[in-house]
């Protein structure tokens, strides 16, 4: 359904708001370092040419693709060059080369300042004055700090975030009403962040199909009862709108988004009884209810897997006829009745499965060589099942912050070279699987810890991306998707690696650290531990462990002190010289 | 009592299409392969072809393209849409029940009483 | 895929010991993926046999199937009045597009 102008479709599609909000992002995603005010004076013109081709899909320069649009709109920023560097050699690009160079250019860890949450009374101020303002200005900071954040969906996190205000500044107690709500929008959307991130990462570094197994393997888990056809169509929809969204495609994105949610909805007969509710709301809430809705219940008398798939005479000629759609059909009907089982975990059987069906249908007796694969997915399926009741264990013996500490020890022996924010970061959110997923019984454990691993140890792979240190952390991240979580598991302590320089600055601490929450308070605590383990990545747990309850209560007591600050310089030395003579640094 | 009733079939005219259904009783549709076989007054047995407990169609090379096998394992039955019917597709149409779950083993072990089609102007 | 049996009629008595064979144009899957049925007129066929040589439930004993590959062999050891009927070899072969029957030996009273 080819149009006469790409921008004027788009602008009638989403309607003014959206497509002001969507553009912003856009922007904000590929400019990170540009001021908000120049953000929103390129949106508007962008939304002033929008207009006039609305009015005329023939006036000039219409008919071009939003790509050149934006592309050409992004390159008239004057400080491109001293801001941004070799980003500035984009522009001298033609499209698709300019929008790729763009992409490429996006940075996962900008170096922004931490945003900091004024006081309730200022942001109420704020959100009354110019309520628009405000809202663009959550678009903007988010945006850019989150480059490939899913479009949509920051458009439902925005109208949240203004519903917040909107009820809360009213209230008697505002920080009361509002402080929670924001914790909650702040929390939700890191993770809905990183979630996008592994989409995206899917499809930029392993390929469409990487993404759509993931797809089929999903939406079969949520839709157990749709049809086969039905969960294919689906996927190649899905397919298509997180191409867009991770291509920057954000209008083109937010448009099929929303197509979808409305196809769902139309036939949510065949494909879910669990819909009805996401179907009734707004747009915005249906397509985030829809992507968030529980499975549904299994047909009563699915048949057994293997009649089709080992015992059949046919599988080498269905496989050779469709290969990917054969395959397709196996991890569809492998996923609906595994509910219980992680997306990943599906992967790799699919993936042990293609394998054994390549090497098999080529031998002189397929069947009797292929006979026992099913066997073959027995110690895959208990790997991860023993890796989470182990840690879930420990996880429940030791707690959310001593379970974090363990995970810091364990991945800084294993990969030392990596930078001590990146690690300690990336263990914390490890970290957090036990009291997201642990509560949960048996048959949902593992879809939750797994996946949701994958998406913490994504955020480690393009972290590290950006500045490799690691040729371990490159290979378990680049080798193959669905092992990274089995890769990293499986590394030892790194033997190669050289201890780290003793520096007392590292362990110097002052009185500050005494009014940070207690958030913060560990994030230091924590930072110190990574450190200690690459000065002496040989200490033991209980080495480590002395030396980590010294430093608590040597926290603990000068913040406690009159003289705060002279408790932390005298304390302080003495706590690293028995630090460093218990490790024998 | 586990039994498998076909119905649909009749006259139709030539160029014309019909879909026979074949409900089973007494057991679960979903465990094993179904086929349909048929035989034209007099003549053999021809098989037709068969789908898969997990929905894979299998057909003679002679039905390819005209005939298509379907199930509704919620409503315990198969079917069978043929189209483009032609004189010599007059035959009592049987729906059986095969010994394995995945292919055509050859084996059918329960058959229905069949329905006669008849294709004529 | 031809079936061929042979021979396509045959009369005999009660008490005869009787032999029916089936020819494939190529091997049946496993060397053993064939089927005998019988059937008699107005009714639906019953499976005999499967696998060339395995006794279908509820069959009696003086049926009997041998034969491997492409050669295969119904007997009827001791003829009874009920075994009056058409008698068709079905084979599955390595795609289930290809199973075939074959035309039938019609078995009639002397």
């Known amino acids: 359904d080819a149009h006469k102008s790409e921008v004027a479709h788009r602008f009638k599609d989403l309607g003014e708001e959206n497509f002001k909000a969507l553009v912003l992002i856009a922007f904000a995603q590929y400019l990170q370092q540009c001021p908000f005010e120049d953000h929103v004076k390129l949106v508007n013109e962008v939304t002033e040419f929008a207009k006039t081709c609305v009015a005329d899909e023939s006036a000039e320069n219409c008919d071009k693709s939003l790509h050149t649009l934006f592309g050409d709109k992004l390159c008239t920023v004057a400080t491109l060059r001293e801001t941004y560097g070799e980003m500035a050699d984009c522009c001298a690009k033609q499209e698709p080369e300019r929008n790729e160079c763009f992409l490429q250019h996006k940075d996962d860890n900008p170096n922004l300042p931490r945003l900091v949450r004024p006081e309730v009374d200022v942001m109420c101020t704020a959100f009354h004055d110019n309520e628009e303002t405000f809202l663009k200005k959550y678009l903007y900071e988010i945006a850019r700090r989150h480059p490939y954040f899913y479009a949509p969906e920051l458009l439902f996190f925005a109208k949240r975030y203004k519903a917040a205000f909107t009820e809360c500044c009213q209230a008697a107690d505002k920080a009361a009403c509002l402080l929670p709500k924001l914790d909650e929008l702040r929390d939700e959307g890191k993770a809905s962040s990183a979630k996008q991130r592994l989409k995206c990462a899917s499809l930029q570094k392993f390929g469409e199909r990487a993404f759509k197994a993931w797809a089929v393997a999903r939406l079969s888990q949520r839709f157990p009862k749709a049809e086969f056809a039905e969960v294919s169509k689906l996927v190649t929809d899905l397919t298509k709108v997180h191409t867009e969204c991770c291509h920057g495609d954000l209008l083109e994105c937010a448009d099929d988004r929303a197509d979808l949610a409305k196809y769902i909805c139309e036939n949510q007969d065949s494909i879910s009884s669990k819909l009805k509710e996401c179907c009734e709301k707004p747009l915005l809430e249906k397509s985030h209810c829809i992507a968030e809705v529980e499975n549904d219940e299994m047909p009563a008398d699915l048949p057994s897997l293997a009649a089709d798939f080992v015992e059949s005479k046919d599988v080498c000629k269905n496989y050779a006829e469709a290969k990917d759609v054969f395959l397709g059909m196996f991890l569809y009907e492998y996923a609906r009745r595994h509910p219980d089982y992680s997306v990943v975990l599906l992967l790799r059987l699919a993936k042990t499965y293609e394998t054994t069906l390549e090497k098999c249908c080529a031998a002189a007796d397929p069947h009797e060589c292929y006979a026992k694969v099913f066997d073959e997915f027995k110690p895959l399926v208990e790997e991860p099942q023993n890796l989470i009741k182990q840690n879930c264990e420990l996880f429940e013996q030791l707690g959310e912050y001593k379970f974090q500490n363990a995970l810091l020890v364990r991945y800084t022996k294993k990969v030392p070279q990596v930078s001590t924010p990146t690690l300690v970061e990336v263990s914390r959110n490890l970290g957090k699987v036990g009291s997201k997923c642990c509560k949960h019984p048996e048959a949902k454990r593992m879809p939750c810890a797994e996946d949701y691993l994958s998406v913490v140890l994504n955020q480690l792979c393009v972290l590290h991306e950006k500045t490799p240190v690691s040729d371990r952390v490159t290979k378990c991240c680049t080798e193959s998707l669905v092992n990274r979580r089995p890769c990293f598991s499986a590394l030892e302590v790194d033997e190669t690696y050289v201890p780290k320089e003793f520096n007392a600055e590292t362990f110097t601490f002052h009185a500050d650290i005494c009014t940070l929450s207690e958030k913060e308070r560990q994030i230091k605590k924590q930072t110190a531990l990574v450190e200690l383990v690459k000065h002496k990545p040989k200490a033991t747990k209980e080495q480590l462990k002395a030396v980590m309850d010294d430093f608590a209560a040597f926290v603990e007591k000068c913040c406690k002190a009159d003289d705060k600050e002279t408790c932390f310089a005298e304390e302080g030395k003495k706590l690293v010289a028995a630090s460093q003579a218990a490790l024998g640094l | 009592e586990v039994q498998l009733v076909e119905s649909g079939g009749g006259l139709v005219q030539p160029g014309g299409s019909l879909r026979l259904s074949c409900a089973a009783s007494g057991f679960s549709l979903s465990s094993n392969a179904m086929g349909w076989v048929r035989q034209a007054p007099g003549k053999c047995l021809e098989y037709i072809g068969i789908i898969s407990v997990g929905g894979f169609t299998y057909y003679a090379s002679w039905a390819k393209g005209r005939f298509t096998i379907s199930r509704d394992n919620s409503k315990n039955t198969v079917y069978l849409q043929m189209n483009s019917l032609r004189a010599e597709d007059t035959a009592t149409y049987f729906c059986?029940?095969?010994?394995?779950?995945?292919?055509?083993?050859?084996?059918?072990?329960?058959w229905g009483q069949g329905t006669l089609v008849t294709v004529s102007s | 895929i031809q079936m061929t049996q042979s021979p396509s009629s045959l009369s005999a008595s009660v008490g005869d010991r009787v032999t029916i064979t089936c020819q494939s144009s190529?091997?049946?899957?496993?060397?053993?993926?064939l089927s005998w049925y019988q059937q008699k007129p107005g009714q639906p066929p019953k499976l005999l046999i499967y696998?060339?040589?395995d006794l279908a439930s509820g069959v009696p004993s003086r049926f009997s199937g041998s034969g491997s590959g492409t050669d295969f062999t119904l007997t009827i050891s001791s003829l009874q009045p009920e075994d009056f009927a058409t008698y068709y070899c079905a084979g599955g072969f390595s795609s289930s597009s290809d199973t075939a029957f074959g035309c039938g030996t019609k078995l009639t009273v002397l």
């Open positions: 190529e091997s049946v899957y496993s060397n053993n993926q």
């Open positions: 696998d060339a040589s």
């Open positions: 059986a029940r095969d010994r394995h779950g995945g292919d055509s083993s050859g084996a059918f072990y329960l």
